[in-house]
Each structure stands twice: as structure tokens, then as C-alpha cells.
Interface confidence: medium
Amino acid sequence: DCCSCQEKWVGYRCNCYFISSEQKTWNESRHLCASQKSSLLQLQNTDELDFMSSSQQFYWIGLSYSEEHTAWLWENGSALSQYLFPSFETFNTKNCIAYNPNGNALDESCEDKNRYICKQQLI
Amino acid sequence: ARHCGHCPEEWITYSNSCYYIGKERRTWEESLLACTSKNSSLLSIDNEEEMKFLSIISPSSWIGVFRNSSHHPWVTMNGLAFKHEIKDSDNAELNCAVLQVNRLKSAQCGSSIIYHCKHKL
């Protein structure tokens, strides 16, 4: 039904999340999410994943730098809020962003391998 | 925050179960009571896949497995013998079980550890 997530996905606050245990490059992660009719995690706020805020892991999220817009953009083209990651101005714009559910972000080479989180909105 | 689905608000759903992911630390017995008050049970682990998932969500938490003493078998909350291996079982003071990063360990029941609750849909 409209309120159910697919098997092996987590349902929380009207969203479904796939939390990988495998490590992939950022591009591989993006494609894997797309193949499951979802996209790499786009965060609304840093407590969105507070159900796993004690996790030590970092996960690729759907944020990349657009030279054209000279801004960090989510996969849907919207701009990163300056309040989400206070240190984003010092991120290396050639990198991709890995996120820890306690609210911290790291910029790492997009070719590095990290776990990843896919997100689908239920409604 | 919006609320959807069959689980209480602020709980997560996964594989036909609802989970309360606690952030508070409690003794094993306090955790048991806290879950009961939420009309659920202290976390039970049904299979390896669930254990792997919960280890991703949280590095450690109490589970609903205990023994009366080191001479007694490990049992679940409904009194059934618990079949999976629990590390450090030879220590007589550690009679409650904890999930800790993909493995089960024994711990002192009076220790303050994060707890999670579960109920099946």
C-alpha cells in the first residue's frame, strides 16, 4: 500500500530509506539508487536520520558541486541550505559528500568507496 | 514531521516489524519495563539479516535474552532456549545479552546500555 516500503527498506516519517552495508563509489551509489526507483539521500534537516544517530558510519548522499551554478546542489537541482553543514564553504568542490547521521559531513574523493543511503518519499 | 504507516509515530518500520530506536541508556530490567510500557517487547533478533540491519542502525543495545545464572541456559522473554552464540558466557556476572556490532555478547544486567523495542505487525 502507499504507506509501505519495499522489503529491506526502512520506513520513517513517511520516507523509505535503503541503508547499504556495501561500499561503493559515489557514482555507483547514485546508479544503484536510481535502479531502485529512488535517489541518493537528500536531507531536509540534520535530524532526518535521528533513528540512526548513534551510527559511526559515513554514507554517500546526493549532493554534488555544480560548476555551472557555482553551488552545491541536490540531485533534484535544489541548492544546499547554508544551515545544514556549517563547514560546507570549505568543502573541496571536486569531491562528493559523505554524511554521518549524527549530523556531520565529510568531503571525500568521489572515487572513494563508502556506504550509501537511498531515499523514496511515500507521499 | 508527517506520520505514515502502521507503527507508532517516531518508530521505524522494517520487514514487517516496528522498532523503537532508543537513545536513552537503561539497565536491562528498566529497558524491559520501558518497552512493556510502549506495548512492545525488548528487542528480539530473529535472524542474521535482522542482526546485520540493527547493527547498522545502532552500535549496541540490549536484547530480550537473559539467564538466571551462568549455570542456566540463555532464554528469550517467552522462556524458549536461545540458540545463537553469546560471547563471554563463561563470566558468571554477565547474565543479560547485548547486540554489539553484528555479534551477541553477555553483559552485566545492571549496566546502563541503549535499548530498542520491537513489535511485529
Partner: antibody, heavy 118, light 107 residues
């Protein structure tokens, strides 16, 4: 293999300037930040500053602002540090460092010893 | 500027020992803490970044932990090649700053 090859040791007079070079191989400096770090004799490490070679933006520790100038030439994959108005306090080993992440220093050159003496 | 303090300037241990080196920041650095190894010949290597992430090629006997203002580097099974000076560095705020270093020697 990632390597940072720094220029050779320098003996310079007080009041003079020195320009050190650092040539990268195994990666493109445009994809990284290039930092310079100094270590005075028997002392710890001190961050001087960094450059983003892709857009030539620089940041310096305020203590070195006006004294240090960091530049980069992407065509030769080389970063430079110019230190001016040298005093004996500037006698140190200078390390060039490359880093993909914005907060850590992944690849270090072998260091260049600069001795300031009359 | 954020001050980084390594209270132990030198440390003596035996091969095979478990060694812990600590580092304190003058304010919360939200886990942006890195560890470096400097060999006696001056060669410097990154060991750990963001508190506990092992840099590629670094042996798994090295690990890091901590939060807030207090951090530590642990070498679980000391080897001869680990004899070096270890520096912590905060990457939370510009200017980046280093601890004074902890020199590790063999007993």
C-alpha cells in the same frame, strides 16, 4: 603512485625572500588543496596556508598573512611558497602537502630545509 | 585559534604493547581530528582522519577515537616501525592547528 617532489635546501640571508616549489605526480593538483606546513628545529608542525589550484583561492594562518604567498601552476602541476623578509625565526623545514578532503593532509612532500643566516 | 594539546611529549613502550596517545582541543572540534606519524628522517604520513577513519594503506593496528574536545590514537600491537612522533591536528576551523607531538620510543 602519488608523490610530491620539493625543491632542494636553501641557505638565505636575513631580509631576503625564498621561493620553494613542489611538483605533484600521480594526481592532478586541480583536484586537491595544496597546503604548506612548517617545522622549526625541534618544534612541532605549523600550518601556513593553502591554495585551491582550480580557482586560486587561498587561506593563510593570520600569523603568516603578508609574509607567505602560496601560488600554483596547474600546467606544470606545481605549487609554490614564497616567504619574504626572512629572519632566523624562519629557519625551518617546509612541507608541501596535498589533500582531497578539506580538513586533512593526505600526501606530504619530503620537506625543504630553509636556513636563514648571515 | 583552536589550541591542540598533547600532554605527553614522550612515551616509552615495549614491542607488542598497546599504546594510547591523547590529544585535547581548546573547544569542541566535532570530530574533525586527524593523526599523523613523523619518522625520525622527517617523513610524514597521514594515519587517521575524522577521528577514526583509517587512511588507505595504514595498518589496522592503528585506531582512533574520541569526541568533543578529547581524542586518542591507539596502536594495538606496537612494532619497531611505529617508532616515531605522532601529531594530532584539528580541521574544524581555520587556521588548522597541530598538537605539539608525542614521541614514541622503545623501552
Amino acid at each position: 603512485e602519488v608523490q610530491l617532489q620539493q625543491s632542494g635546501a636553501e641557505l638565505v640571508m636575513p631580509g631576503a625572500s625564498v621561493k620553494l616549489s613542489c611538483t605533484a605526480s600521480g594526481f592532478n593538483i586541480k583536484d586537491t588543496y595544496m597546503h604548506w606546513v612548517m617545522q622549526r628545529p625541534e618544534q612541532g608542525l605549523e600550518w601556513i596556508g593553502r591554495i585551491d589550484p582550480a580557482n586560486v583561492n587561498t587561506n593563510y594562518d593570520p600569523r603568516f598573512q603578508g609574509k607567505a604567498t602560496i601560488t600554483a601552476d596547474t600546467s606544470s602541476n606545481t605549487a609554490y611558497l614564497q616567504f619574504s623578509s626572512l629572519t632566523s625565526e624562519d629557519t625551518a623545514v617546509y612541507y608541501c602537502v596535498g589533500g582531497r578532503g578539506h580538513t586533512w593532509f593526505a600526501y606530504w612532500g619530503q620537506g625543504t630545509l630553509v636556513t636563514v643566516s648571515a | 585559534d583552536i589550541q591542540m594539546t598533547q600532554t605527553t611529549s614522550s612515551l616509552s613502550a615495549s614491542l607488542g604493547d598497546r599504546v594510547t596517545i591523547s590529544c585535547r582541543a581548546s573547544q569542541d572540534i566535532t570530530n574533525y581530528l586527524n593523526w599523523y606519524q613523523q619518522k625520525p628522517d622527517g617523513t610524514v604520513k597521514l594515519l587517521i582522519y575524522y577521528t577514526s577513519r583509517l587512511h588507505s594503506g595504514v595498518p589496522s593496528r592503528f585506531s582512533g577515537s574520541g569526541s568533543g574536545t578529547d581524542y586518542s590514537l591507539t596502536i594495538s600491537n606496537l612494532e619497531q616501525e611505529d617508532i616515531a612522533t605522532y601529531f594530532c591536528q584539528q580541521g574544524n576551523t581555520l587556521p588548522y592547528t597541530f598538537g605539539g607531538g608525542t614521541k614514541l620510543e622503545i623501552k
